[in-house]
């Protein structure tokens, strides 16, 4: 009778992460008597995946009933595959021995490769706000994909960006990979409604590329422009002076009126109007009693926007 052979018909198997891998193995004879074991890798450091005789292997099921006397099919299924399961799996026949079973013959091995989708890209912007004309950096990260080949693109409002640097790690062979990219974006005054998008494409993605977004409203600070104007006299001895605070973002703003350097009133922007570009306008007025002043009055509108140093605009009120 011919000596038992262990047949692993599949040289290689490709499985998607999360799915079940079937590793096929048959023996050509029932003799010698003894169990089958599955290992990942060869040599002394090999990892036991399944032992027919003993042990608990919750992710492994056998394709056929190994308790049947005439069974020669030793194929297994491994559930919920992850990239970490990649490697070469060997079906090994043992001969019954005392006290221990003795390794008799091994199959040629089946290489299990795993394809895994990239995680949803996460885009993060700078910790502090920046003003128009400044260049800010955005990072995009995605993890856990295999194989290594991946494309990453950056867009601002649908226009592709070119100033970015991308790294895929690790550089050498690995079960899965990560991508990290940093893009530089020049802010403009119109960017309150703008979005920066990181787009990742990979062989495993059946839909469109995965996208991560960042709203520039969380990054930009548009400082206000101030204009102080004197309105016609409203009533006897009263002058209305207005301070127009235009095109600012975000809304957080405090305004202080000074009369000849002395604080007259402080208020916080509340009923603002929003511009089409997402910036805000606000107006504050001060009624000045001219009769209370002998000399000309210097009125100052002082604005502290989003915790930044105050900006101010003055107006000289003539007392005739």
């Amino acid at each position: 009778e011919e000596e038992l052979q262990v047949i692993q018909p599949d040289k290689s198997v490709l499985v998607a992460a999360g799915e079940t891998a079937t590793l096929r193995c048959t023996a050509t004879s029932l003799i010698p008597v003894g169990p089958i074991q599955w290992f990942r890798g060869a040599g002394p450091g090999r990892e036991l995946i399944y032992n027919q005789k003993e042990g608990h292997f919750p992710r492994v099921t056998t394709v056929s009933d190994l308790t049947k006397r005439n069974n020669m099919d030793f194929s297994i299924r491994i559930g919920n595959i992850t990239p970490a399961d990649a490697g070469t799996y060997y079906c090994v026949k043992f001969r019954k021995g005392s006290p221990d079973d003795v390794e008799f013959k091994s199959g040629a091995g089946t290489e299990l490769s795993v394809r895994a989708k990239p995680s949803a890209p996460v885009v993060s912007g700078p910790a502090a706000r920046a003003t128009p004309q400044h260049t800010v950096s955005f990072t995009c990260e995605s993890h856990g994909f295999s194989p290594r080949d991946i494309t990453l693109k950056w867009f601002k409002n649908g226009n592709e960006l070119s100033d970015f640097q991308t790294n895929v790690d690790p550089v050498g062979e690995s079960v899965s990979y990560s991508i990290h990219s940093t893009a530089k974006v020049v802010l403009t005054r119109e960017d309150v409604h703008s979005q920066v998008i990181c787009e990742v494409a990979h062989v495993t993605l059946q839909g469109d590329p995965l996208r991560g977004t960042a709203n520039l409203s969380e990054t930009i600070r548009v400082p206000p422009t101030l204009e102080v104007t004197q309105q016609p006299v409203r009533a006897e001895n009263q002058v209305n002076v207005t301070c127009q605070v235009r095109k600012f973002y975000p809304q957080r703003l405090q305004l202080t009126w000074l009369e000849n350097g002395n604080v007259s009133r402080t208020e916080t922007a509340s009923t603002v109007t929003e511009n089409k570009d997402g910036t805000y306008n606000w107006m504050s007025w001060l009624l000045v009693n001219v009769s209370a002043h002998r000399d000309d009055v210097k009125l100052t509108c002082q604005v502290e926007h989003d915790g930044q140093p105050a900006v101010s605009k003055s107006h000289d009120l003539k007392v005739s």
């Epitope: 394809r115 194989p147 062989v203 839909g207």
Partner: antibody
Framework: VQLVESGGRLGQPGTSLTLSCTVS????????MGWFRQAPGKGLEYIGI?????SPYYASWVNGRFTISKTSTTMDLKMNSLRSEDTATYFC?????????????WGPGTLVTVSS | DIQMTQSPSSLSASVGDRVTITCRAS??????LAWYQQKPGKAPKLLIY???FLYSGVPSRFSGSGSGTDFTLTISSLQPEDFATYYC???????????FGQGTKVEIK
């Protein structure tokens, strides 16, 4: 799992024609689908794909003359300004479950003949 | 666009012969290569994907190898039902586009 193309016929140069690919046994919202063609006695040529979410992508030679769209159970190929060189068998195919780099299920094809 | 050059364009062989078909890409496509078999009047059938993985139900006499730019389809022992035309197909992960080789017709000697 099955794909069947329909709509192939004799068409006049300069006219339009829409081919359909009807699928059964799986959902079009889960897979990338593709259109290919093969002129008589020639090799296979890629036309374009439509993603599971409905975005079309085309071969560089298409130049806006063909449009791929889909509903829940059919994928369409609209061909405008037909030319004699569009005479071919048109195939639809589904990409494999492991990735978009290969096509594991193909329809039998539908013949389009462009002639005056 | 990537060009795929298949060779030979045709070959004559006998049942039982070992047959090798090669496919060369104009630039690296890593392992994104598939092989199809097509018979006259029929749709292509997938044989090999990702350069070396045998598609379900395909006889084990078919095998694929290669990566980068050079790929091979081997039929270890040609059977009567294997007389057909074979195509390689690449996928480029950057352009996300597909290209076919011009085909290899395997005929009976």
């Amino acid at each position: 799992v099955q794909l069947v193309e329909s709509g192939g016929r004799l068409g006049q140069p300069g006219t339009s024609l829409t081919l359909s690919c009807t699928v059964s046994g799986f959902s079009l919202s889960s897979y990338v689908m593709g259109w290919f063609r093969q002129a008589p006695g020639k090799g296979l040529e890629y036309i374009g794909i439509i993603s599971s979410s409905g975005s079309p992508y085309y071969a560089s030679w298409v130049n806006g003359r063909f449009t791929i769209s889909k509903t829940s159970t059919t994928m369409d190929l609209k061909m405008n300004s037909l030319r004699s060189e569009d005479t071919a068998t048109y195939f639809c195919a589904r990409v494999g479950p492991l990735g978009v780099d290969y096509f594991n299920i193909w329809g039998p094809g539908t013949l389009v003949t462009v002639s005056s | 666009d990537i060009q795929m050059t298949q060779s030979p364009s045709s070959l004559s062989a006998s049942v039982g012969d070992r047959v090798t078909i090669t496919c060369r890409a104009s630039q690296s496509i890593n392992s994104y290569l598939a092989w199809y078999q097509q018979k006259p009047g029929k749709a292509p059938k997938l044989l090999i994907y990702s350069a070396s993985f045998l598609y379900s139900g395909v006889p084990s006499r078919f095998s694929g190898s290669g990566s980068g730019t050079d790929f091979t389809l081997t039929i270890s022992s040609l059977q009567p039902e294997d007389f057909a035309t074979y195509y390689c197909q690449s996928w480029h992960y950057i352009s996300r586009s597909y290209t076919f080789g011009q085909g290899t017709k395997v005929e009976i000697k």
